[in-house]
């Protein structure tokens, strides 16, 4: 495949991540998302900050954003449920649940991802997969096809160093290394998958990408299990 990137990653194998969603605003990719139930996509709350006047939809079963693919389908959003404690000026509680207008048609290219319910930190050094259609270089180029990268989990103490995120990483957040390989603009809301299980959601703060002293920040889904269950119920 071409050397496309999240940042420092590569093009994903087509349809190998059937849980992957593109949250779209007025027909254009805005954020990543992850199918967690037949009718629900989990993303980041900040993604909808600028969407007040626009039409929000969810694309499932896609590899290319522009090319026709048999598995691709665009769903309208029946209900958008941001976490009640999410706020524009913080990265905390940056979660959003989108209820699709109907249950997704499941198949090899569209399938929910199991998410972590046990509220325990992922071991530092664990390699986790992050995927998205976010920018792929420091010029800001956006890819047409899904990209992914494997990133090692970084311990919270290191991530909270003054030189890094200076205490901002609560127990409800986790970090992954960001030395050249990283998630970036447009990847927000997408999944951080460790051992085939959804562990984190890319936060949508305006962080510098690809700088090892500014690790990627991900919302730990296990910490929000009660809220997710209450919305999906």
């Amino acid at each position: 495949p071409p050397r496309g990137r999240i940042l420092g990653g590569r093009e994903a194998e087509a349809h190998a991540r059937p849980y992957m969603a593109s949250v779209q605003l007025n027909g254009a990719h805005l954020c990543g998302g992850v199918l967690v139930a037949e009718q629900w996509v989990l993303s980041a709350a900040h993604c909808l900050e600028d969407a007040a006047d626009g039409k929000v939809q969810v694309l499932l079963g896609a590899h290319s954003l522009s090319q026709p693919e048999p598995s691709k389908r665009l769903y309208d959003v029946l209900r958008a449920v941001p976490h009640p404690d999410s706020q524009p000026d913080t990265i905390d509680h940056d979660l959003l649940l989108l209820q699709l207008s109907e249950k997704a048609t499941l198949g090899p290219a569209v399938r929910p991802l199991p998410w972590q319910r046990v509220d325990r930190d992922v071991a530092p050094g664990t390699l986790c997969d992050v995927a998205g259609w976010g920018i792929v270089n420091h010029a800001g180029r956006r890819p047409d096809s899904l990209q992914h990268v494997l990133l090692p989990v970084l311990d919270r103490a290191t991530c909270n160093r003054r030189t890094h995120h200076d205490g901002a990483i609560t127990e409800r957040l986790m970090c992954a290394e960001s030395n050249r390989r990283d998630s970036c603009k447009g990847d927000s809301g997408g999944p951080l998958v460790c051992g085939g299980v959804l562990e984190g959601v890319v936060t949508s703060g305006s962080r510098v990408c690809g700088n090892r002293k500014k690790p990627g920040i991900y919302t730990r889904v296990a910490s929000y299990a009660a809220w997710i269950d209450s919305v999906l119920a």
Epitope: G4, I135, N137, H138, A139, G140, G186, S206
Partner: antibody, heavy 113, light 106 residues
Amino acid sequence: EVQLQQSGAELVKPGASVRLSCTASGFNIKHTYIHWVSQRPEQGLEWIGKIDPANGNTKYDPKFQGKATITADTSSNTAYLQLSSLTSEDTAVYYCVNAMEYWGQGTSVTVSS
Amino acid sequence: QSVLTQSPAIMSASPGEKVTMTCSANSSVSDMYWFQQRPGSSPRLLIYDTSNLASGVPVRFSGSGSGTSYSLTISRMEAEDAATYYCQQWSTYPWTFGGGTKLEIK
């Protein structure tokens, strides 16, 4: 459709400053990087710098540090290039560029007394 | 900083002819962009990440290379390809352009 509309040509006196604007349509500048590139008459292209409009972070070619200041206003979806202490050497066409992929039409700046 | 040298500075080709121009860096770079600028127009992205064709660019254009040596090839010259071509590197700050290759039609 992605478009970048730049402000009109400028004729300015040596020592003065000028601010050029670049208004985007078809996309939100917060979701990308905006670059500025200069081109002197009959010369090649020079990268001046870029801004991440989401947080205001900028990066410059050291050659333009102190000469150029890049800012952005996300509420109007507009990026700006301010050029200070102008000399005849700053006479050029200045382009704003989204992700080095979509280019504005350019703004001609002429420095002359 | 990375200095990019394009050669030749000026060249001409007949319609249908194959055209190759090069971009040499004084130190290794990981990827190259190529732009086309027709007289009186803004530059246009042709090639990104060394070899990938930008949207809407005819397939007669191709890019290749690695390390310090990169090239842009037009498989069959057409009249509308008469323009100046610039390479640009994204590996190290400051990001730099080559001086350009002016391609004329015979």
